[in-house]
Interface confidence: low
């Protein structure tokens, strides 16, 4: 309804004399801000005055100040949302109706809240689940419809007057929806808690008793039983009689059926509280208990272990573990049904008594191959000696032993040969099923344990094999000692360190990386001609004629290897310069004459200079000097100079003769 103010707060608040009350409250005014607030006690509307009469517990002034005498009541609200109140202390005569008279600029509202103040602290209320069963966790709740910031309280749980050791979780609510203090206790009741009194005690901050609530626990449980046996030690011999009696010490609800169990299985036609066993046999040994049921379920007594004593039965041997690995530990267990338990054991290995072994278990800390075989035992107790059973077989497994790698070829082995190796061993359990070889290669294994290396490499140094069953045993590596011709033969210039100039002292070295056998011979060759048989080839003063393609050869008893051809380059200044003329050294004027500077040089001439008969340099720098049209004045002696990075060379003079043409002669 849009014509109403909207309030939210608990409908009724509860407290007791001397405590306090905290009233959580929110509101929304119809319009504008709150301008006036009066807290009435039991307000009544006076139609004559059109005002409310009643005790004014609190009155706000328009400026929001609180009159100094209104200390007991606090308005903790604000002008537009909060109308929370506190009364501290609260008195018995505060009980009744509180009226919150709210006025805004244009609207008024009276909101009513009930306050219930008792003379003494009222008791909390214990809430229990509808049914409690033994060992099922339940939550006990203690609820008190009270909480106030100015008056701390605590809730304590007691069982038969003794504080409960389980930790309780206390929570408080001071909201517009609810005001309460709650304590929750998680608890797994046992059957023995049935009928016990649980108390929730309200205490002040100092632990002083204020009030309490009590409930009696109704714990549903299966019947609780006690079993008695004659004879009391439940130890008998075959043919004796045994009586067992079942007593119910507690049941909620009442029990309905009785039965007896042996080793967890129900005994047929045994539905009374007494079980009579006459002339027992050893098969009747076992754990007996009685079972009584009610609506909750079956309850069982403690077990009585009936021991019917008899001499040991034929024994069997259990081996932990077979097959056993050499070096591991093995335990033998002699198993023989007997009561009382056997006190003495006799052990046999392959039919022969094992001296000093009288225990149920035989432990061998480090198994060796000779421990393999059949193990059997005989058990003995106070009633007699059992028979020896069939025994158990111990299989001792071990890796292949004394593995060797054997070269089948005649020695020495040469590069390119086919090498056959075999992998031999002395003994193995289980049998060898495969072989491994190191290093790995694309090699052939024509049969198990045989390796064939086709075209053996010069660098195949050592080979090792392993014989494998469940484990691999490696042999020591064997050296193949492959012999091969010298490798990586090359020509290397030792001196000079830089480029070779004509006249230099030059040394060439014939290098190789390896050779087996080590003894080698050297050969130097140029253009198919033998030059020397040392590892070095020396030139005291190199000439351009020494340039060319050199090879060296290195040989040993296996073969010889040649280097790649190595080019010897000799650098020299231009030499053998001459000027050639085309079409000839006599040319008719008006024609074309070409002078060419020819030379021998390494590196080739990079720069030419031309000179005339007066040793005047001409402004031409190419190898050819072209005169077109040639004039009579061009007649004379010419020479050229060639330059490269090594030096210069000059040609001798060559004379060009230019003669007059017929036309010129005719004009003259």
């Amino acid at each position: 309804d849009s014509s109403k103010w909207v309030f939210e707060h608990p409908e009724t608040l509860y407290a007791w004399e001397g405590a306090c009350v905290w009233i959580p409250c929110t509101y929304r005014a119809l319009d504008g801000d709150l301008e006036s607030f009066i807290l009435f006690h039991n307000p009544e509307y006076n139609k004559n005055t059109s005002k409310f009469d009643g005790t004014r517990l609190y009155e706000s002034t328009k400026d929001g100040k609180v009159p100094s005498e209104q200390k007991r009541v606090q308005f903790l609200g604000d002008k537009n949302k909060n109308c929370t109140l506190s009364i501290h202390p609260v008195h018995l005569n505060d009980s009744g109706q509180l009226g919150l008279r709210m006025e805004s600029k244009t609207e008024k509202w009276m909101e009513r809240i009930h306050l219930n103040v008792s003379e003494r602290p009222f008791p909390p209320h214990i809430q229990l689940p509808p049914e409690i069963q033994e060992s099922q966790e339940v939550t006990l709740t203690c609820l008190l419809n009270f909480s106030c910031y100015g008056y701390p309280i605590q809730l304590q749980w007691l069982l038969e007057g003794v504080p409960m050791r389980q930790a309780a979780v206390t929570s408080t609510s001071l909201t517009i929806k609810s005001v309460f203090t709650r304590s929750e206790l998680k608890f797994s009741p046992q059957w023995s808690h049935h009928g016990k009194i649980v108390t929730c005690q309200l205490q002040d901050a100092d632990g002083k008793f204020l009030s309490n609530d009590t409930v009696q626990l109704n714990v549903k449980h299966t019947p609780k039983l006690e079993i008695k046996v004659t004879p009391s030690d439940a130890i008998v011999r075959e043919g004796d009689s045994v009586t067992m009696t079942c007593e119910v010490s507690s049941s909620n609800p009442e029990y309905t059926t009785v039965s007896w169990l042996k080793d967890g299985t129900s005994l047929k036609k045994q539905n009374t509280f007494t079980l009579n066993l006459r002339e027992v046999t050893k098969d009747q040994s076992g754990k007996y208990c009685c079972q009584v049921s009610n609506d909750v379920g079956p309850g069982r007594s403690e077990e009585v272990f009936l021991q019917v004593q008899y001499a040991p039965e034929p024994s069997t041997v259990q081996i932990l573990h077979s097959p056993a690995v050499e070096g591991s530990q093995v335990e033998f267990l002699c198993m023989s049904l007997a009561n009382p338990l056997p006190t003495n054991y006799t052990w046999y290995h392959n039919g022969k008594e094992m001296q000093g072994r009288t225990e149920e278990k035989v432990h061998i800390p480090k198994i060796l191959p000779w421990h393999a075989g059949t193990y059997s035992c005989v058990a003995e107790n106070i009633l007699g000696t059992g028979q020896r059973g069939p025994g158990a077989e111990l299989d001792v497994q071990y890796p292949p032993k004394k593995v060797t790698t054997v070269i089948q070829n005649p020695m020495p082995i040469r590069e390119g040969d086919t090498v056959t190796l075999s992998c031999n061993y002395n003994s193995s359990n289980p049998s060898v099923t495969r072989y491994e070889w190191k290093p790995h290669g694309a090699w052939e294994e024509p049969s198990l344990g045989v390796l064939k290396i086709q075209n053996v490499g010069w660098d195949n140094t050592t080979i090792a094999c392993a014989a494998c069953n469940s484990w691999c045993s490696w042999a020591s590596p064997v050296a193949l000692n492959v012999q091969y011709a010298p490798r990586d033969v090359r020509v290397r210039k030792i001196k000079p360190l830089s480029e070779i100039h004509s006249g230099n002292s030059v040394s060439l070295q014939c290098d190789f990386s390896s050779s087996h056998p080590k003894e080698v011979q050297f050969f130097w060759e140029k253009n198919g001609r033998l030059l020397g048989k040392e590892s070095q080839l020396n030139f005291d003063s190199i000439s351009p004629e020494d340039a060319g393609s050199y090879s060296c050869w290195v040989n040993n008893s296996i073969g010889q290897t040649a280097s790649k051809a190595w080019t010897l380059e000799v650098l020299y200044a231009p030499r053998r310069l001459r000027v050639s003329m085309s079409p000839g050294d006599q040319v008719m004027e008006g024609k074309s004459a070409t002078l060419t500077c020819e030379s021998d040089a390494n590196p080739p001439v990079s720069h030419y200079t031309w000179f005339d008969w007066n040793n005047q340099s001409l402004p031409y720098h190419s190898q050819k000097l072209r005169l077109e049209p040639v004039k009579v004045q061009h007649s004379g002696a010419y020479w050229c100079q060639g330059t490269n990075s090594v030096g210069k060379g000059r040609s001798p003079l060559s004379t060009l003769t230019v003669y007059y043409s017929p036309e010129t002669i005719g004009r003259r």
Partner: antibody, heavy 124, light 106 residues
């Protein structure tokens, strides 16, 4: 009538040895486990050692382990306790006790007959 | 090893009932035996197993057990019952005795 008679006690210096004997009669000796129990002057009973009917199982109290050795001779109906490296705290009256069962490891049923004890005094 | 704990001394009026207790972890697994020892004499077995009396032991002596506690009850104590009483049980390696309870009959 069951009888257990201990002997071999006396005064001995610390570190020395002593051998106690117990002669049994009036019951089938080799059917039962036997024990030695001691009682220091003015103090309570303390179990020392036990042995099964056939010597197959033997046990010792921690306080004597490694120093004392129990044994029996069924042919002679006799129980023995060899005590080495004796200490002042071994001073006590040593009782020979018959077990109700045959194995010293059996479910305990108690010791139904006791000798009168033999006094061992360890002192320098 | 286990320990058995007994009250050092207990007294009872002539003809009244007295209970001597013995506590220890081993009693969760094994029954206690109870011995009576008078000054200068060897111990005498009075109760063994759950509640068994050797012949010659009066029926005023009885035994009981719950959890880790064993009890010896004398119903109608007599002057001749004044003695030291020892409980005894098996533990993991052998026997263990309680420290003994001196019973005085007033």
């Amino acid at each position: 009538e069951v009888q257990l008679v201990e002997s071999g006690g006396g005064l001995v210096q610390p570190g020395r040895s002593l051998r106690l004997s117990c002669a049994a009669s009036g019951f089938t000796f080799d059917d039962y486990a036997m024990h030695w129990v001691r009682q220091a002057p003015g103090k309570g009973l303390e179990w020392v050692s036990g042995i099964s009917w056939n010597s197959g199982s033997i046990g010792y109290a921690d306080s004597v382990k490694g120093r004392f050795t129990i044994s029996r001779d069924n042919a002679k109906n006799s129980l023995y306790l060899q005590m080495n490296s004796l200490r002042a705290e071994d001073t006590a009256l040593y009782y020979c006790a018959k077990d109700k069962g045959g194995g010293y490891y059996d479910f305990w049923s108690g010791s139904d007959y006791w000798g009168q004890g033999t006094l061992v005094t360890v002192s320098s | 090893s286990s320990e058995l704990t007994q009250d050092p001394a207990v007294s009872v009026a002539l003809g009244q009932t007295v209970r001597i207790t013995c506590q220890g972890d081993s009693l969760r697994s094994y029954y206690a035996s109870w011995y009576q020892q008078k000054p200068g004499q060897a111990p005498v077995l009075v109760i063994y197993g759950k509640n068994n009396r050797p012949s010659g032991i009066p029926d005023r002596f009885s035994g009981s057990s719950s959890g880790n506690t064993a009890s010896l009850t004398i119903t109608g104590a007599q002057a001749e019952d004044e003695a030291d009483y020892y409980c005894n049980s098996r533990d993991s390696s052998g026997w263990v005795f309680g420290g003994g309870t001196k019973l005085t009959v007033l």
